[in-house]
Every structure is written in C-alpha cells, then in structure tokens.
C-alpha cells in the first residue's frame, strides 16, 4: 500500500466573521488506524481544535460522517468564526496507540478573519476653544481584519489634510485598531459646524462607517458687548440696555452694578437661536436720575461659560436731568430679554470705556 | 483509555428475550461502530451486527435478522442488544467491540456477557 | 456470503520456532486497494483482541514477532518465534463485505 499523505489544499482561506470555514483534508491511505486530530499552530504550545476520537467541541464538526466505510474525508466545518480563530491549521494523522502516536501533519491551512471595524467614535477637546485656535479631534474603531484600513476626516463636507493615523498592532494579529487624531482651526461661523470620520475597510462592501462631532461641544464664541441708553421712558428714569450678541454656548450671567454696587444679576436662559447656532441678549435697567446727586456709572458685566467677566460700562448725566421733588425712590430695575436689538438713533448722552 | 464494560450474566427460558447493555467511555462514542459477535461454549466467534450511534444505522447479519435489535442511548454512551425468542443453542457469551478504523473490524472488546437458555 | 476456511483447525509448535496459519477466503477481499483481512488472538477466557488489520498491518502494542501477509484469497498469519505467552486461539475475519470469521485455529506448544 501506498505510504500516507495528509492532503490539505487550500494554503489559505477567509472568512468574515460570524460565518462558517470549512477547513479540507483528506489522507491517501486507510493505514495506519488511527484518529485525526486538528491543531491550530505548530509545535508544543499548539491548541487542539478537534479530536476525532475523543473531547467536546462544540463549534467543530467533521464534514464527512466519521463511521463511513473507507473514510479518507477529514475535513472540518468551525461554526461563528471570530478574529480569534485567525492561524494556520492542521489536519494530524496519528496512529492508534496508547497514547496514539503522531504519524504525519498536513501543510497547513490558514485561517484569516475579516472583521468589520467598530463604529467610528469621535471624541473633541476637553475644553472649548475660541475661533483662531486649533483643537484636536480623534477617531478610534477597533476589532477589523485585515490591518488594510482607510480614514478620511471632513469637515462639513470638505476633506481635511492635517491629520495623523495609527494602525495596531504593527505586527501580525488576529485584529487590528485605528486611531487618528485631526487638527481643526476653529471660525465663529463653526457653531453648526461638523467633523466626520470616515473609515473604508474591504469588510464593508464600499459602504464606509461614518462617526461625527459637532464643533458645538468644542468652541467658545464670546459675545460682544455694547450698552446704550435709550429715550427717556418717563420724567427722571433713564432706560439703559446692555446689548450681549454673537455668543456661544448660552451659559452666560449678567450683572448690572451701579457705581460699583451690584444692582441685579440674572441668567441666561431659553434663548433663541441665531441663524449662525450663536445668541444674543438684551437687558435692560431703569435708572432714576432724581436719587442721584452726582453722575451713575452703569457697568454691564458679563461672565461667559465660566470665563473671566467683561465689563462694558456708561455714565449717566444727572445734571442733564433736572430732580423732581419728594421722589425716594433710588433705582428700578427691569430686565428682559429681547432676540434682535435695534440700534437706537439717540445715543446722546452715553460714554464708551 | 477505551472502555467498553458490559452488564452482567443473564440465565433465561426459551422463548424469552434477553438484553444485554454495553457502556462506553475512552472515546466519542458517537464516532465509532458499535458490533455485537458471541461465542458458544467452545466454538468460534460469530458476528451478530453492527451499529453506527450518530445515527442508528445498522447491518445485521442474516441469521439475527428477525431475532436481534440493535440501539443506543447516546445520553449515556450505551449500546443494547436484545435478541428475542431465545434457544439453548442462543447459549454464548455476547460480546460488544468497537471498529476504531471504520473498517468494520473490530479493535476494542468488552469482557462479554454469558446468557444461559435452559428450561 | 464470503466463506473464511483457517487451516490448520489446530497445531502444536515448538517454543522459538515459526508458526503459520493459513485464511483462504471462498472470493477475493481485495476493495479500494486493501485487502479486508483482519487477524486475532483469543486466551482462554477473555475477549479476542485485534492483532493485524487490513492483511499486513500490525495494531498498535503487538510484537513484531506477528506479522500477516497474503491478496486477494489467501492469507497468513506468521509467527516469527514462538513465545509462551502465544498460545490462544487466532481467528481471521473478513470486512470486504459485513464481517465474517474463520472457524479458529488452535495454536499450541510441541
């Protein structure tokens, strides 16, 4: 009789995961008896897969009915494959023995897993930034085989350049994570703003994985402040606004001080958006010049998403308007908020600081 | 190591069945042939039949065709034969033995059961 | 039905000398490239056990004093040099088709 072959001949095949891979192997002989046993890896540290007489292997099936009269069919059939079936394969002869004894290997199957990579997730700054400045955006999927990948960031729309990606491991593995951090220059128009990783792998059929951030979590638009005082509203009260437009996010307290004194503090909220995804807010305070004596300085000061106060202050004129008699009455003080404002043609008798 | 352990003596009437067990362990039992042969007193082997237990095929020999049924609890790695409408010349001891090599031969044996058919 | 007839039915050799037992089958065994001949050994109160498989080839843990030979419908068991301990009862059987044995033949000491 001829001398056994152990014939396995597929070098190598691929499986996506979660199907199946059947992995061929037949032998030439009928002799010696004795049980096929499958190993992934060679050497000592090899793992068993599959005995054919003996032990539990759920996942692994013969192809062929063992018990068939003349069986030389030892192919194996690995059910829900994972990356971490990934390895060569093979298919042992052993004779019969106490314990069996090996007799002849076949060459070896590999087994590659293609994985698809996880959905990209996009994380910002931990700290908003102003327009002008640069923040760093990272992208990470993990879990994807082969190592071949492509990313690409966008920023609405528009491929940026000034990006740099990693794959890992370098070396070979049963799977493979990207991380790929972007550098992104920050306008005040980027309040709607979005940036997009997009991740190409051979797993997804060209339909690539997108993850996103909005720009909203990372910026900082400060407000621009002016105070104006408006027409009289009545004898002695004199109606000043304090005008806070163009900031982003909304968390934003106002307070009015009068010489110096805190008069009224309030908080931004509920406000309704600028077309730019900015806000604006208007106050106002009413001042009544007759409990004065002397000039009042009006401060407007604004403290924005927890950065340091900007004031913006106006000097109301008591001289310029005469007191009324009997009057105790020292200020009052209203506030609204207001979505436009409207620039007052009567602006005679403030002072810019 | 491969164990095939068989249930004990049996004496029975004529007419009567008997059925005789055979629990395996060593191995998967599920991938082996399971073949019943006996021995009477002081003569050679003779093959009943044979069992696959992944799914209950079986061939019999013509002689036990009528008579002997195989089968097999796959829960508790145990093969059966029961042989019906016994006779004295039934008298042998049963054994069981596994076909390693799917080559119908027969590579492990069990110690054998005695049935006796006496009146 | 395939027919195994063994000869000698008995025979008597002495300790270190060859013995050899004949299987002639009543139609060739030879399938697939094999020949379907298997041998045993049976002592006196125990099961056979499996000495040659597929005509020439010795099972695992048997001397290599055993050896088998023979194609098609004749074949042979060989005892290089008898020991002792070879004194049974040695059976052919043949799978070309459902198992069958042969009668036995005895095997004893001159």
């Known amino acids: 009789e001829e001398e056994l072959q152990v014939i396995q001949p597929e070098k190598s095949v691929s499986v996506a995961a979660g199907d199946s891979a059947t992995l061929n192997c037949t032998v030439t002989s009928l002799i010696p008896v004795g049980p096929i046993q499958w190993f992934r890896g060679a050497g000592p540290g090899r793992e068993l897969i599959y005995h054919q007489k003996e032990g539990h292997f759920p996942r692994v099936t013969s192809v062929s009915e063992s018990t068939k009269r003349n069986n030389m069919d030892f192919s194996i059939h690995i059910s829900n494959i994972t990356p971490a079936d990934a390895g060569t394969y093979y298919c042992v002869k052993f004779r019969k023995g106490s314990p069996d004894v090996e007799v002849k290997s076949g060459a070896g199957t590999e087994l590659s897993v293609r994985a698809k990579p996880s959905a990209p997730v996009v994380s910002g700054p931990a700290v908003r930034a102003t327009a002008e400045h640069t923040v760093s955006f990272t992208c990470e999927s993990h879990g994807f085989s082969p190592r071949d990948i492509t990313l690409k960031w966008f920023k609405n729309g528009n491929e940026l350049s000034d990006f740099q990606t990693n794959v890992d491991p370098a070396g070979k593995s049963v799977s493979y994570s990207i991380r790929s951090t972007a550098r992104v220059v920050l306008t005040r128009r980027d309040v709607h703003s979005q940036v997009i990783c997009e991740v190409a792998h051979v797993t997804l059929q060209g339909d690539p994985l997108r993850g996103t951030a909005n720009l909203s979590e990372a910026i900082r638009v400060p407000p621009f402040l002016e105070v104006t005082q408006q027409s009289m509203r009545a004898d002695n009260q004199v109606n000043v606004t304090c005008q806070v437009t163009k900031f982003y996010p909304q968390r934003l307290q106002l307070t009015w001080l009068e010489n110096g004194n805190v008069s009224r503090t309030e908080m931004a909220s509920a406000l309704p958006e600028n077309k730019d995804g900015t806000y604006n807010w208007t106050s106002w305070l009413l001042v009544n010049v007759s409990a004065h004596r002397d000039d009042v300085k009006l401060t407007c000061q604004v403290e924005h998403d927890g950065q340091p106060a900007v004031n913006k202050s106006f000097s109301v004129k008591v001289s310029a308007h005469p007191k009324e008699q009997g009057s105790n009455t020292a200020a009052e003080n209203t506030g609204t908020n207001e979505r436009d404002y409207k620039d007052d043609d009567d602006k005679h008798h403030h002072h810019h600081h | 190591q491969v164990q095939l352990v068989q249930s004990g003596a049996e004496v029975k009437k004529p007419g009567a069945s008997v059925k005789v067990s055979c629990k395996a362990s060593?191995?998967?039992?599920?991938?082996?042939?399971i073949n019943w042969v006996r021995q009477a007193p002081g003569q050679g082997l003779e093959w009943i039949a044979m069992?696959?237990?992944?799914?209950?095929?079986?061939h019999y020999n013509q002689i036990f065709k009528d008579r002997a049924t195989l089968t097999t609890d796959t829960s508790t790695s145990t093969a059966y034969m029961e042989l019906r409408s016994l006779r004295s010349d039934d008298t042998a001891v049963y054994y069981c033995?596994?076909?390693?090599?799917?080559?119908?031969?027969?590579?492990?044996w069990g110690r054998g059961t005695l049935v006796t058919v006496s009146s | 039905d395939i027919v195994l007839t063994q000869s000698p039915d008995s025979l008597a050799v002495s300790l270190g000398e060859r013995a050899t037992i004949n299987c002639r089958a009543s139609?060739?065994?030879?399938?697939?490239?094999?020949?379907?001949i298997f041998w045993y050994q049976q002592k006196p109160g125990q099961p056979p056990k499996l000495l040659i498989y597929?005509?020439?080839n010795r099972d695992s843990g048997v001397p290599d004093r055993f050896s088998g030979s023979g194609s098609g419908t004749d074949f042979t068991l060989t005892i290089s040099s008898l020991q002792a301990e070879d004194v049974a009862v040695y059976y052919c059987?043949?799978?070309?088709?459902?198992?069958?044995f042969g009668q036995g033949t005895k095997l004893e000491i001159k």
């Open positions: 033995a596994m076909d390693y090599g799917s080559l119908y031969a027969m590579d492990y």
């Open positions: 060593g191995y998967t039992f599920t991938n082996y042939w």
């Open positions: 069992i696959d237990p992944s799914d209950s095929e079986t």
């Open positions: 139609q060739s065994v030879r399938s697939s490239g094999y020949n379907w």
């Open positions: 597929l005509a020439s």
């Open positions: 059987q043949e799978s070309r088709e459902l198992p069958t």
